[in-house]
Interface confidence: low
Amino acid sequence: AVNGTSRFTCFYNSRANISCVWSQDGALQDTSCQVHAWPDRRRWNQTCELLPVSQASWACNLILGTPDSQKLTAVDIVTLRVMCREGVRWRMMAIQDFKPFENLRLMAPISLQVVHVETHRCNISWKISQASHYFERHLEFEARTLSPGHTWEEAPLMTLKQKQEWICLETLTPDTQYEFQVRVKPLQGEFTTWSPWSQPLAFRTKPAALGKDT
């Protein structure tokens, strides 16, 4: 960052999107600002308009190509600059040499579905979205189940330390409404973080049969 009150954070989704957030104490809300991306060794460059997300922070997405195109690799460096308009010219407010595969945040898993549900168990599957083939199987997942009367924050985390796009939830209560979420993280990257949580999947366990427990 150009000064101590500015924070500029970006993540690569491993395919064709870099999402950035810039926060600046005391910055003017009506200033027009952009993120400029200049890869060190590629023919293209890209710009996105920073839009306010709070009183002192702005965000934008650099769309590098079609969603599943592999636009960057582990040896790419992208110089990212925040440029804000000052009268007739642009002023550089922040800069970073961005290493895409050290700053990964994948898209949230999609296509959650109940494969099989019983009274005490539920088998759920999902798919990862726009994840690079470079990861091969080097991904991990976290999942959580929302029980009645609890909040998501109270839900215990279940960790899957391998690329496993399904889970069998056990010890559930019969005839009960639950919600389920999952997120994904590559093992690669010093500053890599978890994806957003998936959209919740609502499901209901089967009622217990009269006179017996299945």
């Epitope: 200049w38 060190d40 040896v75 040499d97």
Partner: antibody, heavy 119, light 106 residues
Framework: EVQLLESGGGLVQPGGSLRLSCAAS????????VHWVRQAPGKGLEWLGV???????DYNAAFISRLTISKDNSKNTVYFQMNSLRAEDTAVYYC?????????????WGQGTLVTVSS | DIQMTQSPSSLSASVGDRVTITCQAS?????MYWYQQRPGKAPRLLIY???NLASGVPSRFSGSGSGTSYTFTISSLQPEDIATYYC?????????FGQGTKVEIK
């Protein structure tokens, strides 16, 4: 025309330091990365490190404890400093820049500067 | 580090001969580069991204390969091709070069 001009080579005592300069013309060091490569007499090429356009660096792990690459954007010049020199650091040191296209290698090289480490 | 092994280390051929140099990487690489270095001169880029000819390079030079095995060819050796040729990978850091192939005229 893109040009790179190294300077600062010469005789250095074992245990001493060297500071080389790479003056760039025809492009700005705020827009392109500059790499350093060396070649010992009669030997092959060895990549040492790079300073990226925004100012961050990557080093060959074999040299990370004694190597610093920096730059002065106002002078459009990149600097290479290596400490604790030994005889095996005797080499021609080159600065180099990749071209403009997608994955196009070291298209531009300086003429090299000879560093001799000897007492 | 990825080790690059060039073969042969030296060769002698006649003007007009077809010359082939191979470069074996210790693990798979995505992009291969080839340089020519004449005595006392800086290296010169000949081939980038495995098979693309650098600007101003004669068409008698070519490159091919994938994975761990790459090939550099001079289709018709000329007197000015006397030099040492190096391969280089740019898939992981540190960037590494082959040990070089010295080409001489018989």
């Amino acid at each position: 025309e893109v040009q790179l001009l190294e300077s600062g080579g010469g005789l250095v005592q074992p245990g001493g330091s060297l500071r080389l300069s790479c003056a760039a013309s025809g492009f700005t060091v705020t827009s392109y990365a500059v790499h350093w490569v060396r070649q010992a007499p009669g030997k092959g090429l060895e990549w040492l490190g790079v300073i990226w356009s925004g100012g961050s660096t990557d080093y060959n792990a074999a040299f990370i404890s004694r190597l610093t690459i920096s730059k002065d954007n106002s002078k459009n010049t990149v600097y290479f400093q290596m400490n604790s020199l030994r005889a095996e650091d005797t080499a021609v040191y080159y600065c180099a820049r990749a071209g403009d296209a997608n994955y196009d290698g070291f298209a531009y090289w300086g003429q090299g500067t000879l560093v001799t480490v000897s007492s | 580090d990825i080790q690059m092994t060039q073969s042969p280390s030296s060769l002698s051929a006649s003007v007009g001969d077809r010359v082939t140099i191979t470069c074996q990487a210790s693990s798979s690489v995505s992009f291969m580069y080839w340089y020519q270095q004449r005595p006392g001169k800086a290296p010169r880029l000949l081939i980038y991204d495995t098979s693309n000819l650098a600007s101003g390079v004669p068409s008698r030079f070519s490159g091919s390969g994938s994975g761990t095995s790459y090939t550099f060819t001079i289709s018709s050796l000329q007197p000015e091709d006397i030099a040492t040729y190096y391969c280089q990978q740019w898939s992981t850091y540190p960037l590494t070069f082959g040990q070089g192939t010295k080409v001489e005229i018989k």
